[in-house]
Interface confidence: low
């Protein structure tokens, strides 16, 4: 079995302000066990956008039912996009650990650009 890959098919997505942005992410394997998270930006200063395991993210919905057996799709939709949402979003797979989950692999990132709202 190939080692898990985190696939973000799009390098960039452009969305008009006020619309929703769909950011796509897929895994190629169910192994290792552990949650996925979405971040904006990389490194220590990255911002958590969505955590599959816990938290409240009112603007984020998942495209697929993440609890569905054998689900490999972790795409998300972010509503009411504003220029402040522009940036590069990373889908990150974590490996279940004790006491803390450990980052396993990141997608290549999808750059979200925000167009002015059509007048």
């Amino acid at each position: 079995e190939d080692e898990l890959q985190v696939i973000q098919p799009e390098k960039s997505v452009s969305v008009a302000a006020g619309e929703s942005a769909t950011l796509r992410c897929a895994m190629t394997s169910l192994i290792p066990v552990g949650p996925i998270m979405w971040f904006r930006g990389a490194g220590a200063g990255r911002e958590l956008i969505y955590n599959q395991k816990e938290g409240h993210f009112p603007r984020v919905t998942t495209v697929s039912e993440l609890t569905k057996r054998n689900n490999l799709d972790f795409s998300i939709s972010i509503s009411n996009i504003t220029p402040a949402d522009a940036g590069t979003y990373y889908c990150v797979k974590f490996r279940k650990g004790s006491p803390d989950d450990v980052e396993f692999k990141s997608g290549a990132g999808t750059e979200l650009s925000v167009r002015a709202k059509p007048s």
């Epitope: 190939d2 890959q5 696939i7 973000q8 098919p9 799009e10 390098k11 997505v13 452009s14 969305v15 008009a16 619309e19 929703s20 942005a21 769909t22 796509r24 992410c25 897929a26 190629t28 495209v63 697929s64 490999l72 799709d73 972790f74 795409s75 939709s77």
Partner: antibody, heavy 121, light 107 residues
Framework: QVQLVQSGAEVKKPGASVKVSCKAS????????MHWVRQAPGQGLEWMGW????????NYAQKFQGRVTMTRDTSISTAYMELSRLRSDDTAVYYC??????????????WGRGTLVTVSS | EIVMTQSPATLSLSPGERATLSCRAS??????LAWYQQKPGQAPRLLIY???NRATGIPARFSGSGSGTDFTLTISSLEPEDFAVYYC?????????FGGGTKVEIK
């Protein structure tokens, strides 16, 4: 009936623009991405880009950046592809094709019949 | 960009014979591969997705196999309506890319 109906053939002069439409019926228009794929005479298939009809988000192939614009009108379940600064090598059949929004549902399971765009002086 | 290479370019066979078409990816695309059939003057039609799953309404004589970089489309017994061009396509990586096609023609 689930189908994609495209606009008719076009003949354009070099430097002009063309706008092709693709009307969806029989399914929820906003539930699938719409892609555009072209095929030059006797050649293979070339992906141009997609639009998310729900959000209006777009993603274009690098080759067409700056020349292509994809839009949609959800009120009439129609997607549009406009290609500007046409050249003779843009002569092709242009197809719209739908694709599931989930990254794991990423195949073109429904195609329009194609629109022939001929660029000639 | 992932390069998809199909072989042979042309396959000359008779009705009732078995057709074996190959598709190779320049790097692993896992099982994220589709096969399409295109007849003259028509749009492509999805035959196989995820390397081995038949699309709705596709006859059982069409089957797909493979993973990683090497894939095969097999038509167990050619019917007259199967003579067409077949394309493979990967959608694991951006941008989606198609192979150059294999033409299955009547011998």
């Amino acid at each position: 009936q689930v189908q994609l109906v495209q606009s008719g053939a076009e003949v354009k002069k070099p430097g002009a623009s063309v706008k092709v439409s693709c009307k969806a019926s029989g399914y929820t228009f906003t539930g699938y991405y719409m892609h555009w794929v072209r095929q030059a005479p006797g050649q293979g298939l070339e992906w141009m880009g997609w639009i998310n009809p729900s959000s209006g988000g777009t993603n274009y192939a690098q080759k067409f950046q700056g020349r292509v614009t994809m839009t949609r009108d959800t009120s009439i379940s129609t997607a549009y592809m406009e290609l500007s600064r046409l050249r003779s090598d843009d002569t092709a059949v242009y197809y719209c094709a739908r694709e599931g929004i989930a990254a794991t549902d990423a195949y073109f399971d429904l195609w329009g019949r194609g629109t022939l765009v001929t660029v000639s002086s | 960009e992932i390069v998809m290479t199909q072989s042979p370019a042309t396959l000359s066979l008779s009705p009732g014979e078995r057709a074996t078409l190959s598709c190779r990816a320049s790097q692993s695309v896992s099982s994220y591969l589709a096969w399409y059939q295109q007849k003259p003057g028509q749009a492509p039609r999805l035959l196989i997705y995820d390397a081995s799953n038949r699309a709705t309404g596709i006859p059982a004589r069409f089957s797909g196999s493979g993973s990683g970089t090497d894939f095969t489309l097999t038509i167990s017994s050619l019917e007259p309506e199967d003579f067409a061009v077949y394309y493979c396509q990967q959608r694991l990586f951006h941008p989606p890319t198609f192979g150059g096609g294999t033409k299955v023609e009547i011998k």
